[in-house]
């Protein structure tokens, strides 16, 4: 069965910005990827890029930059405006859609370890959970 | 202006074979989803059989797995419909449609149809 | 495969009244449903997609919503032209999977 791994994490350098991380394990090629916040797209969540392989991406604030990083994987950078970093406590949510298999999404969050007062930066793990 | 154009379809024999094509204009149709779908006398909707872009991934529905094929010829626009060992429930009328990605693979265009009928 | 329940089947009103029509997946389909209208003699037509988003040149009295298992198509203000079959389906997961439709008729 296909899964969606999300990671989110939060640069070390920078504690505004961060990074979303989201992938696709399984067979079939990808169609489309979207990436919402705060939820799932169209349950109350709110799009932040949609990444198409041939036809490019388009981006809303405050994504940064979307991008691929393999035919499956997709990473998405993020600045945080707001001095309290809401982005520690966000849901980030990504949909793979493949044709003819369909979707599958899953949402991840900052590990509990990632807190801004924390001096080290979290090592990655992916962030596995059941489609929604 | 996008267009779809089904032809091939006609009166046939139980057990008997049929191919049906659709011709695309007005979009690269090299790079679009295609399926073909047919709506039954009862007037139901079915997906009968789909082709990736990419031309490898195919879906076929159930009753019609190892009966039909579904193909591209890019070279044409068009795309083809191989029925065999046609069965009583065939019977319908077979549209062809394009997949847009960005609807969430919503069917964006089809056909006007054509008819299968299969007696016995 | 997931199973799509269309009601009701038929509805028989009169210009300027507002309709709604159910769709109801057998498991969560997210927000992968579209909706499509049939005129007689016509193929169909895709008039919303991802539940809400209007197709282009689709009026606005057309409404989708819903989420995961439960969707809802309504016409704000029936025109003599909507007289047509309304079908949910879901682009999900494979096999797509149509309801069984709606008849819109004007009195």
């Known amino acids: 069965t296909p899964e969606v791994w999300v990671q989110v994490q939060m640069e070390a350098t920078e504690l505004s910005s961060f990074t979303v991380h989201c992938g696709f394990l399984g067979p079939g090629s990808i169609s489309l990827v979207t990436v919402s916040w705060g939820g799932p797209d169209g349950a109350g969540g709110t799009k932040l890029a949609v990444l198409h392989p041939e036809l490019g991406t388009r981006q809303w604030a405050p994504a940064r930059q979307a991008r691929w990083e393999t035919q499956s994987s997709i990473s998405l950078a993020l600045e945080d405006s707001g001095a309290s970093s809401p982005f520690a406590n966000t849901t980030f949510c990504c949909k793979f859609a493949s044709f003819p298999e369909g979707s599958w999404e899953s949402c991840g969050s900052l590990p509990p370890s990632s807190d801004p007062g924390l001096s080290a930066p979290p090592t990655p793990v992916p962030i596995l959970r059941a489609d929604l | 202006d996008v267009q779809l154009v089904e032809s091939g379809g006609g009166l046939v024999k139980l057990g008997g074979s049929l191919k049906l094509s659709c011709v695309a204009s007005g979009f690269t149709f090299s790079s679009y989803h295609m399926s073909w779908i047919r709506q039954t006398p009862e007037k139901r909707l079915e997906l009968v059989a789909a082709?990736?872009?990419?031309?490898?991934?195919?879906y076929y529905l159930d009753t019609v797995k190892g009966r039909f094929t579904i193909s591209r010829d890019i070279a044409k626009n068009t795309l083809h419909l191989q029925m065999s060992s046609l069965k009583s429930e065939d019977t319908a009328l077979y549209y062809c449609a394009r997949h847009e990605d960005y609807y969430g693979f919503a069917m964006d265009y089809w056909g006007q149809g054509t008819s299968v009928t299969v007696s016995s | 495969s997931i199973v799509m329940t269309q009601t009701p089947k038929f509805l028989l009103v009169s210009a300027g009244d507002r309709v709604t029509i159910t769709c109801k997946a057998s498991?969560?389909?997210?927000?992968?449903v579209a909706w499509y209208q049939q005129k007689p003699g016509q193929s169909p037509k895709l008039l919303m997609y991802y539940v809400s988003n209007h197709y282009t040149g689709v009026p606005d009295r057309f409404i989708g919503s819903g989420y995961g298992t439960d969707f809802t198509f309504t016409i704000s203000t029936v025109q003599a032209e909507d007289l047509a079959v309304y079908f949910c389906q879901q682009a999900y997961r494979s096999p797509w999977t149509f309801g069984g439709g709606t008849k819109l008729e004007i009195k």
């Open positions: 082709i990736n872009s990419n031309d490898i991934n195919t």
């Open positions: 498991q969560s389909v997210t927000n992968d």
